[in-house]
C-alpha cells in the first residue's frame, strides 16, 4: 500500500537568464528511494539521481542543469522556453512510483521569484522489479 506523499515547490516563477531550484520531497513512508527521475513538460528527461550510483545529467541539458541541492535540480540560464511543467518521479521499494509536479514560469520582467510549497496529489503504480530489494543505499 502506498502511504507516501510528495511535497514540491509548486508553482514558481523566475527571471529569464536566472536560475531556479526544483525540489520534491517524499514523506509519510518508510519506503527506500532507489531512483529519482526529473522530466520536462515534453516528457524529455533532464536528470537521474540513482541512490546507489549518483547523478546523471542528460546531454541536452549538460550545460545548464546542475544536480542538487539534495534530490532537487537547479536550472540555470533560464529561457522563455523553459516555462512549463516539470515532474519528479520517485522510484521506491516496496511502495512503487510516486510523482510530483512543478510549474515553472519564466518571466521577462524583474518580478521577484517566489516559491509556494504545497502538497499535491500523487500518482502511483505497482513496482514489480524484485531486484530492487537489493537497492539498500538511501541518500
Amino acid at each position: 500500500m502506498m502511504t507516501g506523499t510528495i511535497e514540491t515547490t509548486g508553482n514558481i516563477s523566475a527571471k529569464k537568464g536566472g536560475s531556479v531550484i526544483l525540489q520534491c520531497h517524499l514523506s509519510s513512508t518508510m519506503a527506500q528511494v532507489t531512483q529519482v527521475n526529473w522530466e520536462q513538460h515534453d516528457h524529455s528527461l533532464l536528470a537521474i539521481r540513482n541512490a546507489e550510483l549518483g547523478w546523471h545529467i542528460y546531454p541536452a541539458f549538460k550545460d545548464r542543469v546542475a544536480p542538487g541541492p539534495g534530490l532537487g535540480l537547479t536550472l540555470q540560464s533560464l529561457t522563455m522556453n523553459d516555462t512549463g511543467e516539470y515532474f519528479c518521479t520517485y522510484h521506491t521499494y516496496p511502495d512503487g512510483t510516486y510523482r510530483g509536479r512543478i510549474f515553472l514560469e519564466v518571466l521577462e520582467s524583474s518580478v521577484a521569484e517566489h516559491s509556494a510549497r504545497f502538497q499535491i496529489p500523487i500518482e502511483g503504480r505497482d513496482y514489480k522489479d524484485d531486484d530492487d530489494k537489493h537497492h539498500h543505499h538511501h541518500h
Partner: antibody, heavy 121, light 107 residues
Framework: EVQLVESGGDLVKPGGSLRLSCAAS????????MSWVRQAPGKGLEWVGR??????????DYAAPVKGSFTISRDDSKNTLYLQMSSLKTEDTAVYYC????????????WGRGTLVTVSS | SYDLTQPPSVSVSPGQTASITCSGD??????ACWYQQKPGQSPVLVIY???KRPSGIPERFSGSNSGNTATLTISGTQAMDEADYYC?????????FGGGTKLTVLG
C-alpha cells in the same frame, strides 16, 4: 569487482539466428543501462543498441543496420543481458561486446572480453 | 544517420602532446567519449561525458567538446599510448562511434 562475460558466439549460416548472453556481476545490474557493441575483423567499433534500466522505462534503441533483426532484452533477476539476432548476414560477423553505458561516475567504462559471431555458408 | 569523422592517423614524438579530433553535427549537444584499443584487447574508456577521466586513467589524458568538435589530448605522450582511439557520441537515444584514429608514437 565488476565483471561482464559474454557467451553464445558461434558459426552460423546466413539467414540463421543466434542468441548472445552477457552475465554481469559485481554491481547492481538493474541500475545500469547496457549496450552491445560489435567489431568486425580488422575494422572499427560499431554500436549495436542499448537497453535502459527498468526505472527509465526499460526501453531499447538500435543502430539502423540491425533494427528489426536484432532484439536486446534483460533479466534483472538473473543479472543477464541478451542479444537475439535473426536473419543474420555475412556482414554481421564480428566480436560482440557487452558494455555498461557511461551514465554514472561510479559505474562507467566496463566492457566484456567479447564473443565471436561468424556468419558464413 | 549521424556520422563522426576522425583522422585515420596521428603521429607524435615521445613527450609531446597529441591531439585527436572528432567532428559531428552539433556534437557539443551530446556527450563525447573516447576509447583506447590495443591489438587483441577490449577497448578501454579513457574519457567520458566530454572531459571526465575514469579511475585508473592517467592525468595526461584530457578531453573537451564544444560546437561540432570533440578533442582528445594526450600530454607527455608515452610509447604505451600507441593504440587505436575511437570517439563516441552518446545521448539518451543513440550512440555512434567514429572510424578510429591510429596513434603512432615515433622513435
Amino acid at each position: 569487482e565488476v565483471q561482464l562475460v559474454e557467451s553464445g558466439g558461434d558459426l552460423v549460416k546466413p539467414g540463421g539466428s543466434l542468441r548472445l548472453s552477457c552475465a554481469a556481476s559485481g554491481f547492481t545490474f538493474s541500475n545500469a543501462w547496457m549496450s552491445w557493441v560489435r567489431q568486425a575483423p580488422g575494422k572499427g567499433l560499431e554500436w549495436v543498441g542499448r537497453i535502459k534500466s527498468k526505472a527509465n522505462g526499460g526501453t531499447t534503441d538500435y543502430a539502423a543496420p540491425v533494427k528489426g533483426s536484432f532484439t536486446i532484452s534483460r533479466d534483472d533477476s538473473k543479472n543477464t543481458l541478451y542479444l537475439q539476432m535473426s536473419s543474420l548476414k555475412t556482414e554481421d560477423t564480428a566480436v560482440y561486446y557487452c558494455v555498461i553505458d557511461p551514465l554514472y561516475d561510479i559505474l562507467t567504462g566496463y566492457w566484456g572480453r567479447g564473443t565471436l559471431v561468424t556468419v558464413s555458408s | 544517420s549521424y556520422d563522426l569523422t576522425q583522422p585515420p592517423s596521428v603521429s607524435v614524438s615521445p613527450g609531446q602532446t597529441a591531439s585527436i579530433t572528432c567532428s559531428g553535427d552539433k556534437l557539443g549537444d551530446k556527450y563525447a567519449c573516447w576509447y583506447q584499443q590495443k591489438p587483441g584487447q577490449s577497448p578501454v574508456l579513457v574519457i567520458y561525458q566530454d572531459s571526465k577521466r575514469p579511475s585508473g586513467i592517467p592525468e595526461r589524458f584530457s578531453g573537451s567538446n564544444s560546437g561540432n568538435t570533440a578533442t582528445l589530448t594526450i600530454s607527455g605522450t608515452q610509447a604505451m599510448d600507441e593504440a587505436d582511439y575511437y570517439c563516441q557520441a552518446w545521448d539518451s537515444s543513440t550512440a555512434v562511434f567514429g572510424g578510429g584514429t591510429k596513434l603512432t608514437v615515433l622513435g
